[in-house]
Amino acid sequence: KAMHVAQPAVVLANSRGTASFVCEYASPGKATEVRVTVLRQADSQVTEVCAATYMMGNELTFLDDSICTGTSSGNQVNLTIQGLRAMDTGLYICKVELMYPPPYYMGIGNGTQIYVIDPEPCPDSD
């Protein structure tokens, strides 16, 4: 079953290559187990950036080597992606799945265009 997911259209990464955005979903029921996946669409390909499954009311847990961190509050997930460089500019899509209890619901946001600008190297000081 389909579910509506909202996310901002555009986000600019900061000078340290970190970008944050909120992914909000319209839950049709009382889900206790939710899976959030961040996908990146670029060059006619979709790749998975990171994913986390969490129990409602608990923290999101990404893998140790993940470039993503996040927190949840109700039907909102605050996502942060770190270590971005200019070549990582692209459309980042939030996919939310209500895993338990049944029925299964899935929603996909319209994507957040994340722009990353590599910082200029500091000039050598004499």
Epitope: A2, L39, Q41, S44, Q45, V46, T47, L91, I93, M106, I108, G109, N110, G111
Partner: nanobody, 126 residues
Amino acid sequence: QVQLVESGGGLVQPGGSLRLSCEASGGTLDYWSIGWFRQAPGKEREEVSCISGTGLRTNYADSVKGRFTVSRDNSRNSVILQMNSLKPEDTGVYYCTGKLLHPSLWSACANEYDLWGQGTQVTVSS
């Protein structure tokens, strides 16, 4: 650059079955809208089936409804067209087509396609 490759065609008797596969080389078909077209000798190319990027929506031409089934096999990075109760009028070259739409359209079939495979011949004859 992604390329589409069809396989599974051949000669089959009326009432028989074939399983066509559309695979991607040089990339993945994740979240791509995939269509199946066929062209019979002396006839125009027609779309027989499509499946949305999420796999939640499928469409079929009236002539194949109830006989053909399209599905995604993400583990093998392919889209399958299962053709049952084949008729002589199903004879033709079958083409796999694909397009990666904006995420807002991942639940829909594409209106037009960017990528075409080389086709696989299906002949239904006794």
